[in-house]
C-alpha cells in the first residue's frame, strides 16, 4: 500500500550512523531500512561530536542534518567491513548508533504506558551530553521507586548537547509484565522511528541500555551460524520486519485511502488534523480525549462531546503523539520523520472513547462475585471522578493565573468555562453512579430470582422424596426462606436508593414495590402450605419451623421499622450516595391510615400443623396444585404431595384482589402462572416461582 510522499517525506527509516573501531562506519539506508557500509570505503570510528555530525552530513547529503544524538539503546549490526576488504562477514557487533537529526530539533514522542508517568527536566543554565541526561532521568525514576522506561533529549544547545530530558517512569513490576504496552510501542516505534530495523523492535519494551543487554547479544550469537550460511544480505531480517506491517494493514485503513484525495499528501493531512483546535462538538457528553496543541507543541487532554468536532481527537496521548508529535515539527514534515509507507497512519475518528473500569463492569455479565465486582467498579468510578475533578481544578487555577491580566469579561468567560466543566463532570459522575447502581440492582435481582427458584425447587423436591426426610426438608425450607428474605431486602433497598436519588421516580414505583412485596408474601404462604400437605414431616419439624418463622417475622419488623424511622439505608459504599439532609421523614411506603399494618407484610403467621389459616381478605388461599379429581374441598393436612400428576396441569391461575383505600393503584392484580415444565414433577410448583417480577 503506497502512501503519497513529497520528496524525502516517505523515508523508511531514521538516518543514523554506527561505528565500531577497526571496522568501516555503517549508516542506515533510509530507503530500505538496512545498515550500509561507508560509501567511500575509508571512514572508520570518529572521536569527536563535530566529526560525527559532519559524517552524518556526508552520508546523507540530500537531508538537512543539523545535529546528532546518541541513540537510547544499542543495536546489533552484522556485516562490518574492514578497510580495503570486499568480504564483510564478521561477528555481529552490539553498538550504540548516533541518530542524525534532520532540520529543526523536535523532541521525541515518548509513549506513556498505563500506570507510567511522563516527566521532564529543563535547566537553561546547563548544557550537557546525552549520557548526563540519561543519568538524570534514571536517577529521577529511581528516587520515585520506578524504572526508567524511555527518554529523549530536549532543547539542544550544541552538538549532542542538550538543556533537558523528557522521560517516562514506570512502576517496578510493570516493566517486566506489562506486555500490552510493549506491544503497543512496537507497533508505533516502527512507524515513527525504526523502519525495518528489527533490533529497534526487539528492544522496544525497555529502551534503557543496561537492561537485557547480555540476553540480546547471546541471542544474536546463537543465530549467527544460520545467518552466515543463509542470510547473505539480511533478507531474513527484512522479512521478519514486514510481518507486523501486514497485520497492521489489515487492522486499519490507510490515511491515503480514507481521508485524503489522491493529490493530497499524508503530510498535508496530518498537518491539517494536528493543527485544528480541540473541538468539543455540539453534543454534551464528557469523553476524555487528547488533541495536539500547536501552541505548546504537545498533546493535551480535552473533553469531547461525543459527536461532531474534528479529527484532532485521539483516544490516548500516545496515539496523539504518534500521529502529531513528530509530524507537527514542521521542518520534519519536509524531511524524514513522516508517516511511513510500511504502516499507514491511523487517524482518529469521533467514535466513543475506550472503555474504562466502569464500562468494563457494565459490559461483563454478572456472576457469583457480583458484589465484589460492583464494589470495585464503584471505587474505580469514584477514583476516576476525583482524579478528573482535581485535574480540572488544577487547570482552572492555571487558567486563572494566566488570565489575571485579561479584561474582566474575558476572566469571567474563563471562570464560566471551568464552572461548566465542573458541573458537567458532576453530572457525568452522577449518571455513571446511577447506571452502575441500576445495573448492579438488575443483576442482583436476576441472581435472587435464580437462587429463589432453585431453593424452591429443592424444597419441593425434598417434600416429594419417598420417604421424605424432615431434617432435609427443614434445611431446604430455611434456604428458601432466606432467598425470599434477600429478595425483599433487595427490593426495599432498591426502593430506598431510588427514593434518595429520585423522589419522583420513587413515588411512581411505590405501588410496584408494594405489589412485589405482596407477591413475596403470597409465594411464601403458598410454599409453607405445601409443608402441611405432608403432615408427618410438618409435625416433626414444627418447633424449628415456628422458630424460623418467628425470626423471619422479627427480621421483617426490623427492616420495615428501620425504613420508617431512618430513611438512609447505605447501599454498600456511601461514597456512591448523595448525602441526605438531617431530616428523618417517614418513608411513604406504607399507608398510614391504620388499614395496613406491618403484619400485612409478614409472609405468614405462625400456625400449628392442624390449623390452616383462614382465607381472609388479605391472605390468598394457598394453591392446591393437584388435579381436580384428587383434590378435596379444602386443603388440609394429610392430603399428601406424592401423587401429583403434573401432566394434567395446563395452567394455574390466581386472582388476588387487593382492596386498599390508601391510594395505591393495586386493585385487581391478576397473577397468572403457567406450568411450563409439563411432564416433570416440578410443573406443579411453577406457579410458586413468580417469574415476572413486578418491580420496575
Amino acid at each position: 500500500l503506497e502512501v503519497p510522499t513529497d520528496g524525502n517525506a516517505g523515508l523508511l527509516a531514521e538516518p543514523q550512523i554506527a561505528m565500531f573501531c577497526g571496522r568501516l562506519n555503517m549508516h542506515m539506508n533510509v530507503q530500505n531500512g538496512k545498515w550500509d557500509s561507508d560509501p567511500s570505503g575509508t571512514k572508520t570510528c570518529i572521536d569527536t561530536k563535530e566529526g560525527i555530525l559532519q559524517y552524518c552530513q556526508e552520508v546523507y547529503p540530500e537531508l538537512q542534518i543539523t545535529n546528532v544524538v546518541e541513540a537510547n539503546q544499542p543495536v546489533t549490526i552484522q556485516n562490518w567491513c574492514k578497510r580495503g576488504r570486499k568480504q564483510c562477514k564478521t561477528h555481529p557487533h552490539f553498538v550504540i548508533p548516533y541518530r542524525c537529526l534532520v532540520g529543526e530539533f523536535v523532541s521525541d514522542a515518548l509513549l506513556v504506558p498505563d500506570k507510567c508517568k511522563f516527566l521532564h527536566q529543563e535547566r537553561m543554565d546547563v548544557c550537557e551530553t546525552h549520557l548526563h541526561w540519561h543519568t538524570v532521568a534514571k536517577e529521577t525514576c529511581s528516587e520515585k521507586s520506578t524504572n526508567l522506561h524511555d527518554y529523549g533529549m530536549l532543547l539542544p544547545c550544541g552538538i549532542d548537547k542538550f538543556r533537558g530530558v523528557e522521560f517516562v517512569c514506570c512502576p517496578l513490576a510493570e516493566e517486566s509484565d506489562n506486555v500490552d504496552s510493549a506491544d503497543a510501542e512496537e507497533d508505533d516505534s516502527d512507524v515513527w522511528w525504526g523502519g525495518a530495523d528489527t533490533d529497534y523492535a526487539d528492544g522496544s519494551e525497555d529502551k534503557v541500555v543496561e537492561v537485557a543487554e547480555e540476553e540480546e547479544v547471546a541471542e544474536v550469537e546463537e543465530e549467527e551460524a544460520d545467518d552466515d550460511e543463509d542470510d547473505e544480505d539480511g533478507d531474513e531480517v527484512e522479512e521478519e520486519a514486514e510481518e507486523p506491517y501486514e497485520e497492521a494493514t489489515e487492522r486499519t485503513t490507510s490515511i491515503a485511502t480514507t481521508t485524503t484525495t489522491t493529490t493530497e499528501s499524508v503530510e498535508e493531512v496530518v498537518r491539517e488534523v494536528c493543527s485544528e483546535q480541540a473541538e468539543t462538538g455540539p453534543c454534551r457528553a464528557m469523553i476524555s480525549r487528547w488533541y495536539f496543541d500547536v501552541t505548546e507543541g504537545k498533546c493535551a487532554p480535552f473533553f469531547y462531546g461525543g459527536c461532531g468536532g474534528n479529527r484532532n481527537n485521539f483516544d490516548t496521548e500516545e496515539y496523539c503523539m504518534a500521529v502529531c508529535g513528530s509530524a507537527m515539527s514542521q521542518s520534519l514534515l519536509k524531511t524524514t520523520q513522516e508517516p511511513l509507507a510500511r504502516d499507514p497512519v491511523k487517524l482518529p475518528t469521533t467514535a466513543a472513547s475506550t472503555p474504562d473500569a466502569v464500562d468494563k463492569y457494565l459490559e461483563t455479565p454478572g456472576d457469583e462475585n457480583e458484589h465484589a465486582h460492583f464494589q470495585k467498579a464503584k471505587e474505580r468510578l469514584e477514583a476516576k471522578h476525583r482524579e478528573r475533578m482535581s485535574q480540572v481544578m488544577r487547570e482552572w487555577e492555571e487558567a486563572e493565573r494566566q488570565a489575571k491580566n485579561l479584561p474582566k469579561a474575558d476572566k469571567k468567560a474563563v471562570i464560566q468555562h471551568f464552572q461548566e466543566k465542573v458541573e458537567s463532570l458532576e453530572q457525568e459522575a452522577a449518571n455513571e453512579r446511577q447506571q452502575l447502581v441500576e445495573t448492579h440492582m438488575a443483576r442482583v435481582e436476576a441472581m435472587l430470582n435464580d437462587r429463589r427458584r432453585l431453593a424452591l425447587e429443592n424444597y419441593i423436591t425434598a417434600l416429594q422424596a419417598v420417604p421424605p426426610r424432615p431434617r432435609h426438608v427443614f434445611n431446604m425450607l430455611k434456604k428458601y426462606v432466606r432467598a425470599e428474605q434477600k429478595d425483599r431486602q433487595h427490593t426495599l433497598k432498591h426502593f430506598e436508593h431510588v427514593r434518595m436519588v429520585d423522589p419522583k421516580k420513587a413515588a411512581q414505583i411505590r405501588s410496584q414495590v408494594m405489589t412485589h412485596l405482596r407477591v413475596i408474601y403470597e409465594r411464601m404462604n403458598q410454599s409453607l402450605s405445601l409443608l402441611y400437605n405432608v403432615p408427618a414431616v410438618a409435625e416433626e419439624i414444627q418447633d424449628e419451623v415456628d422458630e424460623l418463622l418467628q425470626k423471619e417475622q422479627n427480621y421483617s419488623d426490623d427492616v420495615l421499622a428501620n425504613m420508617i424511622s431512618e430513611p438512609r439505608i447505605s447501599y454498600g459504599n456511601d461514597a456512591l450516595m448523595p448525602s441526605l439532609t438531617e431530616t428523618k421523614t417517614t418513608v411513604e411506603l406504607l399507608p398510614v391510615n391504620g388499614e395496613f399494618s406491618l403484619d400485612d407484610l409478614q409472609p405468614w403467621h405462625s400456625f400449628g400443623a392442624d390449623s390452616v389459616p383462614a382465607n381472609t381478605e388479605n391472605e390468598v388461599e394457598p394453591v392446591d396444585a393437584r388435579p381436580a379429581a384428587d383434590r378435596g374441598l379444602t386443603t388440609r393436612p394429610g392430603s399428601g404431595l406424592t401423587n401429583i400428576k403434573t401432566e394434567e396441569i395446563s395452567e394455574v391461575k390466581m386472582d388476588a384482589e387487593f382492596r386498599h383505600d390508601s391510594g395505591y393503584e393495586v386493585h385487581h392484580q391478576k397473577l397468572v402462572f403457567f406450568a411450563e415444565d409439563v411432564g416433570s414433577n416440578k410443573g406443579a410448583i411453577i406457579g410458586l416461582m413468580v417469574g415476572g417480577v413486578v418491580i420496575a
Epitope: 500547536v294 473533553f303 491580566n405 485579561l406
Partner: antibody, heavy 126, light 107 residues
Amino acid sequence: EVQLVESGGGLVQPGGSLRLSCAASGFTFSSYSMNWVRQAPGKGLEWVSYISRSSSAIYYADSVKGRFTISRDNAKNSLYLQMNSLRDEDTAVYYCARETTVTTRFYYYYYGVDVWGQGTTVTVSS
Amino acid sequence: DIQMTQSPSSVSASVGDRVTITCRASQGISSWLAWFQQKPGKAPKLLIYAASSLQSGVPSRFSGSGSGTDFTLTISSLQPEDFATYYCQQANSFPRTFGQGTKVEIK
C-alpha cells in the same frame, strides 16, 4: 506600562547575518508566547516565527526556515531572532509581538497578538 | 498553509459610513481569527480577537463576526481616525497567516 522594544536592525549584505533583540517590560514575559512579524516596504504583514512560553514549541514561516532562529531568555525578559544567510527579500521592518493565550491542558483560548513593538528596520542590500 | 483572502483590497468611504471588510480562509479555522488596524509608519493594533471579541480600549463601532471560513469586520460609523489599512490573521494553525490587507481611504 506594557512595552516591547526591538533593536539590532541595520544594513547588511546578502548572505550576511544579523541578530534582532526585543526587550519586554511591564508584564510577566515568561507567561506569554512571542512572535516576530515583518513588513516589507509597501507590502502587507508577514508572520515570521513563534516561540511558546517555555520554548517547547517553535515555528517558522517556510520563507525563513533553516536560516532564522528564534529564541528567548525569560530571565532577561528578552526575545531574539538570529538571521543568517540573509536575502534581498528579507528587507523589512521587523516587529516583535506578544501573543496572549490561555492554554491549559483542558482549555485553549486565543486573545490575539495584542502588544507590538515599534519595529526595527533590516535592509539587505549589496 | 491556510491562505487568507481579504476583500476588497481598498474601499473609499466618508465619515459616518458603514464599512464592511470580509476575510475568507482557505480552510476552516473555527473562530480563531483576529483583525488589526495599521496606520502608516506605525505598528499594527489589535481590534478584534476570536472572530468577534472586541479588544479592550477599542471603540464599539468596530465589530467582528463569522466562523469557519468566512469572517467580517464592520465599522458601523466611520470616524476620521479610522482611515487605515486593516488585516485579518488566522490563529488556528502554524504557520500563522495574514490577509493581504484592505485600505480604507477617504472618499
